[in-house]
Interface confidence: medium
């Protein structure tokens, strides 16, 4: 079965006008000696194993949280954007237990 890594919105620093990055300052494990990690770009799983995962939506990968999710088309919701809404949902069940 496919393992989905959920995504959360990366927050912005309040000094964003001085810093073009939308990510918080982070400490990345491994450092310079982490098998040349600095020069190795991580593969986007949306282009590989999650390519066809989102049914009515677009796969999104947020690298700084190592997380994948589906950005749903307007009328769809759910983990894979597979459920169609009859009306606006003010409350969505967040329990994504497998």
């Amino acid at each position: 079965s496919v393992r989905v890594e959920q995504v959360v919105k990366p927050p912005q620093n309040k000094t964003e006008s001085e810093n073009t990055s939308d990510k918080p300052k982070r400490k990345k494990k491994g450092g310079k000696n982490g098998k040349n990690r600095r020069n190795r770009k991580k593969k986007n799983p949306c282009n590989a194993e999650f390519q066809n995962f989102c049914i009515h939506g677009e796969c999104k990968y947020i690298e700084h949280l190592e997380a994948v999710t589906c950005k749903c088309q307007q009328e769809y919701f759910g983990e894979r954007c597979g459920e169609k809404s009859m009306k606006t949902h003010s409350m969505i069940d967040s329990s994504l237990s497998k």
């Epitope: 393992r3 989905v4 890594e5 959920q6 995504v7 959360v8 919105k9 990366p10 927050p11 912005q12 620093n13 309040k14 964003e16 939308d22 918080p24 300052k25 982070r26 400490k27 990345k28 494990k29 491994g30 700084h64 949280l65 190592e66 997380a67 999710t69 589906c70 950005k71 749903c72 307007q74 919701f77 983990e79 949902h89 003010s90 969505i92 967040s94 329990s95 994504l96 237990s97 497998k98």
Partner: antibody, heavy 124, light 112 residues
Framework: EVKLVESGGGLVKPGGSLKLSCAAS????????MSWVRQTPEKRLEWVAT????????YYPDSVKGRFTISRDNAKNTLYLQMSSLRSEDTAMYYC?????????????????WGQGTSVTVSS | DIVMTQPPLSLPVSLGDQASISCRSS???????????LHWYLQRPGQSPKLLIY???NRFSGVPDRFSGSGSGTDFTLKISRVEAEDLGVYFC?????????FGGGTKLEIK
């Protein structure tokens, strides 16, 4: 049912160290970023640390940076907080919290489930 | 850091009444993506905080519809249309638009 159970708290002297653990169940632990939040004796809530799903990226406020280390073991469904150079102002109830998105058109960043907490007292 | 202010510290209400809890941030909480990452939590006596409202006005799973959130920019409000006994506790607002993430000091909802 999402369940988060913290342990490892206790009484420690200033300058000492302590390692907190949080056992997670009821959801796919490896799929969620996780955080630690503390509540001071005055009942103020303070964000302490956040870790990405795979543990590669960690985030801290300046107040604990360099002293606290958040980590996770996805095979054991466990989150950790290693605390060193402890100060009296670190005295608090420490909560483990899931960064759980509800996705409907776009995502948000909030702590949707919290454990019951473990108490840390730093005193000589 | 963004300062979240929640006056008053205590809000006495009668059961069945409407309650209104305010939260003000020291800077705008509108993210560059257009969203406002302002959330509300309830901490009942002896319990851990529970998420009630996310992104200003969206009720979390299982939260009764008597709870509603509103506001924009720097001023936000949580309304409880008919207060029930289980609603008593401390309400915290929280922002995750800016790093570090910060919380308000809390407003205690108690019986008049």
């Amino acid at each position: 049912e999402v369940k988060l159970v913290e342990s490892g708290g206790g009484l420690v002297k200033p300058g000492g160290s302590l390692k907190l653990s949080c056992a997670a169940s009821g959801f796919t632990f490896s799929s969620y970023p996780m955080s630690w939040v503390r509540q001071t004796p005055e009942k103020r809530l303070e964000w302490v640390a956040t870790i990405s799903t795979g543990g590669t990226y960690t985030y801290y406020p300046d107040s604990v940076k360099g002293r606290f280390t958040i980590s996770r073991d996805n095979a054991k469904n466990t989150l950790y907080l290693q605390m060193s150079s402890l100060r009296s102002e670190d005295t608090a109830m420490y909560y483990c919290a899931r960064q759980g998105p509800i996705y409907y058109g776009n995502y948000y960043y909030a702590m949707d489930y919290w454990g019951q907490g473990t108490s840390v007292t730093v005193s000589s | 850091d963004i300062v979240m202010t929640q006056p008053p510290l205590s809000l006495p209400v009668s059961l069945g009444d409407q309650a209104s809890i305010s939260c003000r941030s020291s800077q705008s909480l509108v993210h560059s993506d257009g969203n406002t990452y302002l959330h509300w939590y309830l901490q009942r006596p002896g319990q851990s905080p529970k998420l009630l409202i996310y992104k200003v006005s969206n009720r979390f799973s299982g939260v009764p519809d008597r709870f509603s959130g509103s506001g924009s920019g720097t001023d936000f409000t949580l309304k409880i249309s008919r207060v029930e006994a289980e609603d008593l506790g401390v309400y915290f607002c929280s922002q995750s638009t800016h790093v570090p993430y910060t919380f308000g000091g809390g407003t205690k909802l108690e019986i008049k």
